[in-house]
C-alpha cells in the first residue's frame, strides 16, 4: 500500500480467482484513543472499533472511503483504491490502446518545435467518475523539471456504438536547450482513477522523436509566362524553431489530381519554392519535416491549381 | 579546416558532408536486421557516447562567439562513432550485407573528422566504452542503439554546419 495523495491510498493486488489479497491496517488520524468506530462509504454498519482497523482487501467491494468516528463526529477519512496486477502485468482498463506507432501505446505526444513544449493525449470510453493527474521530468534517476498543466477533455468522437473521449495535457521543460542533442528522455507519467480503480501509464521519448512541424504557411502559386508551370512558394510555420539557418526544414511538394487514383507528382526540396506543372482540377500541397532528423512530416498545406 | 589554433573550417564542405551523414545514418538504420528487440531495449546504451550538450557552444549564439568549442566536440564525436562502426559490434556476427550503408557511413565519419582536423593536429578523443556484446542478438541491439544515437548526433552537427555556412562563412 502507498499514498497517492493526502488520505488516498493505493492497494496493489495480485488479481486472480481466490487470490489471498492484501492485509491493510488503517490508523485513525486523531489524538483520541477510545470510543472510535469505523464505517465504509455511505454504510452505517460498524466494521470495527479502536484507533486502528485491520482489513483484508481482496476485491473492489473492500475498497472505498473508510471513515473513523467518535460519538457521531467524523475524525478522519482514508480512501482506498485498487491497482490490479494480472499475471505480473498491471491492468490497463481505463485507457484505450492507440496501437500507433506500436501496440500498448496509451499515451501519444507531439511537439511543434524544439522549445521543450509538447502535448500528450490519450483516449478512453469512460465518461464519468474519472480523474487524471500528469507528472513529467527529463530523466528518471536525477530528474530535471518539466511542468505540466491539468489534463482536459479535448475531443469527443462517436466510434460505432461507443463514444470515445480524448484528453490532452500540455507540458513545458523548465530549462530547455533547443540546440543540444538530448541524452536523457522525457518521462511522462499519468495517474488515472476511475471510481475505485487506479492505473498508471507512462511514456518515454526524446523531443526530437515527437517533432511534428505545423504545415508551411502562406502557400502561393505564381504562374510562369507561356508555360503550364507554376512557381509554388511558402514560408516556414510561425511555430517552428528559429533561426531557420540552424533549425532547417525540408519540404515535399505534391501535385494531386481530383481523383485519388491519379498519379501523384512529388518533388522534395530544401528551398521555400518549387516549380511544378499545374494540371487542371489538381491541387498543390506542401508539407514540412526536420531537414536533418526524420521525425514526422507536418500535415499538408494545400491550394487549388486553378 | 578547423585547426586547434582557431581558423575557420570549410563550412560549406562540412555542411554538405554532414547532410550526407544524416542521410546515411537514416538509411543504415533499418538495414542492420529485423529487430523487435529495439522496442523493448529501453535502457540507455549510449550514456557513454559523447553528446553535444548545452554548454558545448553549438547553439547559434555560441557559434558566433567562438565556434572552436563546438567543433572540437563534434570532432570528438565523429572519431568516437567512427571507432564504434569499425568495432566488433558492426564487424561481428551477424554479418552486415556487403552493400550495407554502414561502410559508407564509416568512411564519411572519417572524412568529416579529417575536414575538421588536418593531419598533424590532435584534439583529445574519448575512449570508446566497453559494451561487451557476447551474443549476436546483443550486437544487433547495440547496432540499432548506436545508429539511433548517431542520427541524433549528426543532426546537431549538420545544423551547426548549415548555420555556419549561412552566417559564418567568409
Amino acid at each position: 500500500i502507498w499514498e497517492l495523495k493526502k488520505d488516498v491510498y493505493v492497494v496493489e493486488l495480485d488479481w486472480y480467482p481466490d487470490a489471498p489479497g492484501e492485509m491493510v491496517v488503517l490508523t485513525c488520524d486523531t489524538p483520541e484513543e477510545d470510543g472510535i468506530t469505523w464505517t465504509l462509504d455511505q454504510s452505517s454498519e460498524v466494521l470495527g472499533s479502536g484507533k486502528t482497523l485491520t482489513i483484508q482487501v481482496k476485491e473492489f467491494g473492500d475498497a472505498g472511503q473508510y471513515t473513523c468516528h467518535k460519538g457521531g463526529e467524523v475524525l478522519s477519512h482514508s480512501l482506498l483504491l485498487l491497482h490490479k496486477k494480472e499475471d505480473g502485468i498491471w491492468s490497463t482498463d481505463i485507457l484505450k490502446d492507440q496501437k500507433e506507432p506500436k501496440n500498448k501505446t496509451f499515451l501519444r505526444c507531439e511537439a511543434k518545435n524544439y522549445s521543450g513544449r509538447f502535448t500528450c493525449w490519450w483516449l478512453t470510453t469512460i465518461s464519468t467518475d474519472l480523474t487524471f493527474s500528469v507528472k513529467s521530468s527529463r530523466g528518471s534517476s536525477d530528474p530535471q523539471g518539466v511542468t505540466c498543466g491539468a489534463a482536459t477533455l479535448s475531443a469527443e468522437r462517436v466510434r460505432g456504438d461507443n463514444k470515445e473521449y480524448e484528453y490532452s495535457v500540455e507540458c513545458q521543460e523548465d530549462s530547455a536547450c533547443p540546440a543540444a542533442e538530448e541524452s536523457l528522455p522525457i518521462e511522462v507519467m499519468v495517474d488515472a482513477v476511475h471510481k475505485l480503480k487506479y492505473e498508471n501509464y507512462t511514456s518515454s521519448f526524446f523531443i526530437r522523436d515527437i517533432i511534428k512541424p505545423d504545415p508551411p504557411k502562406n502557400l502561393q502559386l505564381k504562374p510562369l509566362k507561356n508555360s503550364r508551370q507554376v512557381e509554388v512558394s511558402w514560408e516556414y510555420p510561425d511555430t517552428w524553431s528559429t533561426p531557420h539557418s540552424y533549425f532547417s526544414l525540408t519540404f515535399c511538394v505534391q501535385v494531386q489530381g481530383k481523383s485519388k487514383r491519379e498519379k501523384k507528382d512529388r518533388v522534395f526540396t530544401d528551398k521555400t519554392s518549387a516549380t511544378v506543372i499545374c494540371r487542371k482540377n489538381a491541387s498543390i500541397s506542401v508539407r514540412a519535416q526536420d531537414r536533418y532528423y526524420s521525425s514526422s512530416w507536418s500535415e499538408w498545406a494545400s491550394v487549388p491549381c486553378s | 579546416r578547423a585547426v586547434p589554433g582557431g581558423s575557420s573550417p570549410a563550412w560549406t564542405q562540412c555542411q554538405q558532408l554532414s547532410q550526407k551523414l544524416c542521410t546515411l545514418a537514416w538509411s543504415a538504420h533499418p538495414l542492420v536486421g529485423h529487430m523487435d528487440l529495439r522496442e523493448e531495449g529501453d535502457e540507455e546504451t549510449t550514456n557513454d557516447v559523447p553528446h553535444i550538450q548545452c554548454g558545448d557552444g553549438c547553439d547559434p549564439q555560441g557559434l558566433r562567439d567562438n565556434s572552436q568549442f563546438c567543433l572540437q566536440r563534434i570532432h570528438q564525436g565523429l572519431i568516437f562513432y567512427e571507432k564504434l562502426l569499425g568495432s566488433d559490434i558492426f564487424t561481428g556476427e551477424p554479418s552486415l550485407l556487403p552493400d550495407s550503408p554502414v561502410g559508407q557511413l564509416h568512411a564519411s565519419l572519417l572524412g568529416l573528422s579529417q575536414l575538421l582536423q588536418p593531419e598533424g593536429h590532435h584534439w583529445e578523443t574519448q575512449q570508446i566504452p566497453s559494451l561487451s556484446p557476447s551474443q549476436p542478438w546483443q550486437r544487433l541491439l547495440l547496432r540499432f542503439k548506436i545508429l539511433r544515437s548517431l542520427q541524433a548526433f549528426v543532426a546537431v552537427a549538420a545544423r551547426v554546419f548549415a548555420h555556419g555556412a549561412a552566417t559564418l562563412s567568409p
Epitope: - | 536486421g33 529485423h34 523487435d36 528487440l37 529501453d42 554479418s95 556484446p133 551474443q135 546483443q138
Partner: antibody, heavy 121, light 111 residues
Framework: EVTLKESGPVLVKPTETLTLTCTVS????????ISWIRQPPGKALEWLGV???????NYNSGIKSRLTISKDNSKSQVVLTMTNMDPVDTATYYC???????????????WGQGTTVTVSS | DIVMTQSPDSLAVSLGERATINCRAS??????????MHWFQQKPGQPPKLLIY???NLESGVPDRFSGSGSRTDFTLTISSLQAEDVAVYYC?????????FGGGTKVEIK
C-alpha cells in the same frame, strides 16, 4: 515447414568419437544459428555449442576441447563431432534452431526430435 | 557460468487452478533492458517446446493461459488455469552469456 532431423550412431564405445548430423529444411543455415543440446536420461538440458550464420562457433567451456561443430550451407547440414566419449555422455542429443536474432534474443524456437546415444563397451 | 535455479522441483495443482514456477539466475540475464530468459515445456518422450521468449513474449500458437514475467535475476512462469495437457516438465533458459544454461526443471502434475 521448418524441420530439423538428427542422425548418427545409437551406440558408441568409450574413447570413440561421436559424429552426429543435423539436416534442416524450411529455412537456410545462412539465416539462422544452430545449437546442439543434450539431455541425459531423467536429467536436465545441457547446451553444448552453437554455429552462427556466418560459420563462427561457441562451445560450452566444460567440454570445449572435445567438441567441433561445422556446417555445409548448400547441403543444409550441421555436424557435431565429440571425441573421447564416456558413459556419462549417454544422452538424447538435440539439434535446435535459434530464433531470429532480432526477436528471440537467444531463444530456441525449433527442436529436432532428438537422437538417443548410448556410450557403453 | 550463470546458474539457473528453479523452484519448486515439482508442483501438484488442481485442474483449472493457477500454477506458478519461479526461476532465479545467479547474475542478471538482462542486456540493456532486454531479458534473455526463455521458458520451455517438455512432455515425456518429446523434445522441449518454446513457450515464452524474452521473459514475457508468448510464442506463436501457445495458449494465452501461459504467461511470463520478471527481469534481471527473478522470473516467473504462470499457468492461469491448469489443463490436463499442461502436465509436463518446465525449464527456464538464459542466453545472455555463454554457455547458455537451463534450470533443473519443474515437474507439473495434477492434484
Amino acid at each position: 515447414e521448418v524441420t530439423l532431423k538428427e542422425s548418427g550412431p545409437v551406440l558408441v564405445k568409450p574413447t570413440e568419437t561421436l559424429t552426429l548430423t543435423c539436416t534442416v529444411s524450411g529455412f537456410s543455415l545462412t539465416s539462422y544459428a544452430i545449437s546442439w543440446i543434450r539431455q541425459p536420461p531423467g536429467k536436465a538440458l545441457e547446451w553444448l555449442g552453437v554455429i552462427w550464420t556466418g560459420g563462427g562457433t561457441n562451445y560450452n567451456s566444460g567440454i570445449k576441447s572435445r567438441l567441433t561443430i561445422s556446417k555445409d550451407n548448400s547441403k543444409s547440414q550441421v555436424v557435431l563431432t565429440m571425441t573421447n566419449m564416456d558413459p556419462v555422455d549417454t544422452a538424447t542429443y538435440y539439434c535446435v534452431r535459434e530464433g531470429d536474432y532480432g526477436s528471440y534474443a537467444g531463444a530456441m524456437d525449433y527442436w529436432g526430435q532428438g537422437t538417443t546415444v548410448t556410450v557403453s563397451s | 557460468d550463470i546458474v539457473m535455479t528453479q523452484s519448486p522441483d515439482s508442483l501438484a495443482v488442481s485442474l483449472g487452478e493457477r500454477a506458478t514456477i519461479n526461476c532465479r539466475a545467479s547474475e542478471s540475464v538482462d542486456y540493456y533492458g532486454i531479458s534473455s530468459m526463455h521458458w520451455f515445456q517438455q512432455k515425456p518422450g518429446q523434445p522441449p517446446k518454446l513457450l515464452i521468449y524474452r521473459a514475457s513474449n508468448l510464442e506463436s500458437g501457445v495458449p494465452d493461459r501461459f504467461s511470463g514475467s520478471g527481469s534481471r535475476t527473478d522470473f516467473t512462469l504462470t499457468i492461469s488455469s491448469l489443463q490436463a495437457e499442461d502436465v509436463a516438465v518446465y525449464y527456464c533458459q538464459q542466453a545472455n552469456k555463454d554457455p547458455y544454461t537451463f534450470g533443473g526443471g519443474t515437474k507439473v502434475e495434477i492434484k
